[in-house]
Interface confidence: low
């Protein structure tokens, strides 16, 4: 069952799925000047059995110079339905853990892929949030959102995260006052 909506937006934060439930689809998008090969699948699909999950199909992009060098491939209407976007990142790894059963890892990049990946998430998917650089994460609870089915409709739970700038006071009891970083910005636990 596909999730109807996008995960919640948090000001000054981005989200990322780090493992993808079976049934998740990833559009085969190409960067400007390239298009999906004619015989290529429009999406990759996370499938699996009881012991192993992997992405079916492979995305392939070819130069569209022969046709229209500025045209960027856009999904067909059925591909656009319930499209989900996440920031393109390097492959995620769950620290020192085995793969999650029933989940696929982030697919490796393919040649000439678009800068943004468009996912179609399924019920049960979890996405994780982090503050953008220069903002500090304050937590009331999990910085994550889960797509759930309730009364026949899908919804994303609300991540309990606030990303605050250096001038904003802490709102959370039990939290230590932030120490200024050398460049004067508040340090964020997700900044590197």
């Amino acid at each position: 069952e596909l999730c109807d909506d996008d995960p919640p937006k948090i000001t000054h934060a981005t989200f990322k799925a780090v493992a993808y439930k079976e049934g998740t689809m990833l559009n085969c998008e190409c960067k400007r000047g390239f298009r999906r090969i004619k015989s290529g699948s429009p999406y990759m699909l996370c499938t699996g059995n009881s012991s192993h999950s992997s992405w079916d199909n492979q995305c392939q992009c070819t130069s569209s110079a022969a046709r229209n060098t500025t045209k960027q491939v856009t999904p067909q209407p059925e591909e656009q339905k319930e499209r989900k976007t996440t920031e393109m990142q390097s492959q995620m790894q769950l620290a020192d853990q085995v793969s999650l059963p029933g989940h696929c890892r982030e697919p490796p990049p393919w040649e000439n892929e678009a800068t943004e990946r468009i996912y179609h998430f399924v019920v049960g998917q979890t996405v994780y949030y982090q503050c953008v650089q220069g903002y500090r994460a304050l937590h009331r609870g999990p910085a994550e959102s889960v797509c759930k089915m309730t009364h026949g409709k899908t919804r994303w739970t609300q991540p309990q995260l606030i990303c605050t700038g250096e001038t904003e006071p802490s709102q959370f009891p039990g939290e230590e006052e932030p120490q200024a970083s050398p460049d004067g910005l508040p340090e964020s636990e997700t900044s590197r």
């Epitope: 780090v18 990142q89 769950l94 994780y128």
Partner: antibody, heavy 130, light 107 residues
């Protein structure tokens, strides 16, 4: 193998200080938030503090805020708990425990211990008594 | 803070029997609940995370269920090594809190 080895407990008088250490090995220390959890004699578990993987964010239980300081030295794979102004009610076995985050080569996503506290230290006893 | 109440305080059972432990939260914690096992003189051990997911290396006889405010840890058939104290813990709100524990003892 994956382990957290604790040290630094002992008997101390009320009002005095003590520092606990928790040395990590067998895993990538910087991919984990680390907690301190304590257990008074014959009682249940009480969460004390947590520090984010790079040491920037620290949270405390109200019962220890202002008296205890959690810190970590990622170059030494070691976690610390500096306990000042100790009270009789701080008497307990103190455990350090790790919680994994999802990490890339560039950063960790603050999933807030999605997998629970999956590896614990052996515990160290702190007795506050006059 | 969220209060977790475990019941019963003590459960007296024989090896091979089924154990059902309850954890009730003072307000909804969604599915953000973990279960730990602790034996005398040892550190706690993670059994279940997020209400129903078995941690790495945990035998299939341990299962968790529930969401919102009511949760259950079930041990389908008690082994001698399962007699211990069990704690639930929520991560839905700061601060993280534990239940007071349920002791599973040999009858």
């Amino acid at each position: 193998q994956v382990q957290l080895v604790q040290s630094g407990g002992g008997v101390v008088q009320p009002g005095r200080s003590l520092r606990l250490s928790c040395a990590a090995s067998g895993f990538t220390f910087t991919n984990y938030a680390i907690h301190w959890v304590r257990q008074a004699p014959g009682k249940g578990l009480e969460w004390v503090a947590v520090i984010w993987s790079d040491g920037d964010n620290k949270y405390y239980a109200d019962s220890v805020k202002g008296r205890f300081t959690i810190s970590r030295d990622n170059s030494k794979n070691t976690l610390y708990l500096q306990m000042n102004s100790l009270r009789a009610e701080d008497t307990a076995v103190y455990y350090c425990a790790r919680t994994p985050w999802y990490c890339t080569s560039t950063n960790c996503y603050t999933g807030y211990y999605y997998y629970g506290m999956d590896v614990w230290g052996q515990g160290t006893t702190v007795t506050v008594s006059s | 803070e969220i209060v977790l109440t475990q019941s019963p305080a003590t459960l007296s059972l024989s090896p091979g029997e089924r154990a059902t432990l309850s954890c009730r939260a003072s307000q909804s914690v969604s599915s953000y609940l973990a279960w730990y096992q602790q034996k005398p003189g040892q550190a706690p051990r993670l059994l279940i995370y997020d209400a129903s997911n078995r941690a790495t290396g945990i035998p299939a006889r341990f299962s968790g269920s529930g969401s919102g405010t009511d949760f259950t840890l079930t041990i389908s058939s008690l082994e001698p090594e399962d007699f211990a104290v069990y704690y639930c813990q929520q991560r839905s709100n700061w601060p993280p809190t534990f239940g007071q524990g349920t002791k599973v003892e040999i009858k």
